[in-house]
């Protein structure tokens, strides 16, 4: 049985809050597909399991996420 | 209108296996939390876990861990808890709950609660 | 994981009465906490999100208070359909953790 082609983005709207990388888990980038025709990015946040939808066009968050993938590339040997 | 329906009352005996499921409507079911709490006869509530279905981020209490699974099917908006090898004490009432979002941001504490499902495992 | 104990486990009281209900965290939690109500036979109900929020539809004699570790409920003037068990619960750090309920029974 095919799915269902309901658009089902997780993002229902984007958090104009800062984030403040160190009190960030994880962060997760989800591509456009057909169920959702726009980029998501989500962040986890340590504390009270809040998952914050966050605006891929922001200048600031785009900072964010060349932060965390230079954080990561140290990381990885 | 929010609604969470569980699935149907379960009689099992000991060792057998079992998935009980809780359907969400009348919200966007991948952005919410959603989350099982077990209540035995005559006690309080006790934090299974919880499950965010647009990413699939599963988190357990201690005290369940290993003993159950909580999945999630976000294209039918049903979110489920397994067990694989019932015991007598795992007879309980077992809710499931939807978490809150305000402005971008989810959370899992339970704004909407599931009907309950009873589960009793005896011989 | 961080524990709540609730107290009093029980309480009798009388229609009319301002009843105050504790929570107390093993730790700091900020003010994320929340309130339940349950009725028996019946699933759980949110009454307060945020240690002082008031869940949409819940009558206003119903107040949070608190942060840190020490929380409160009061129902400001209790009212017979008040009569039930009530938990709080934190949502700072999982595991997730419920108190132990408060039984408020007619006097």
């Known amino acids: 049985v095919p799915l269902s082609r309901t658009v089902r983005c997780t993002c229902i709207s984007i958090s104009n809050q800062p984030v403040n990388p160190r009190s960030l888990e994880k962060l997760e980038i989800i591509p456009a597909s057909q169920f959702c025709p726009r980029v998501e990015i989500i962040a986890t946040m340590k504390k009270k399991g809040e998952k914050r939808c966050l605006n891929p066009e922001s200048k600031a968050i785009k900072n964010l996420l060349k932060a965390v993938s230079k954080e990561r590339s140290k990381r990885s040997p | 209108e929010v609604q969470l329906v569980q699935s149907g009352a379960e009689v099992k005996k000991p060792g057998e296996s079992l998935k009980i499921s809780c359907k969400g409507s009348g919200y966007n079911f991948p952005s919410y939390w959603i989350g099982w709490v077990r209540q035995m006869p005559g006690k309080g509530l006790e934090w299974m876990g919880v499950i965010s279905p647009g990413d699939s981020d599963t988190r357990y209490s201690p005290s369940f861990q290993g003993q159950v699974t909580i999945s999630a099917d976000k294209s039918i908006s049903t979110a489920y808890l397994q067990w694989s090898s019932l015991k007598a004490s795992d007879t309980a009432m077992y809710y499931c709950?939807?978490?809150?979002?305000?402005?971008?941001?989810?959370?899992?504490?339970?704004?909407?609660w599931g009907q309950g499902t009873l589960v009793t495992v005896s011989s | 994981a961080i524990q709540l104990t609730q107290s009093p486990s029980s309480l009798s009281a009388s229609v009319g009465d301002r009843v105050t209900i504790t929570c107390r965290a093993s730790q700091g939690i900020s003010s994320a906490l929340a309130w339940y109500q349950q009725k028996p036979g019946k699933a759980p109900k949110l009454l307060i999100y945020d240690a002082s929020s008031l869940e949409s539809g819940v009558p206003s004699r119903f107040s949070g208070s608190g942060s840190g570790t020490d929380f409160t409920l009061t129902i400001s003037s209790l009212q017979p359909e008040d009569f039930a068990t009530y938990y709080c619960?934190?949502?700072?750090?999982?595991?997730?953790?419920f108190g132990g309920g408060t039984k408020v029974e007619i006097k």
């Open positions: 709950a939807r978490g809150y979002c305000s402005g971008g941001s989810c959370y899992p504490f339970f704004q909407y």
């Open positions: 619960q934190q949502f700072d750090s999982f595991p997730h953790t």
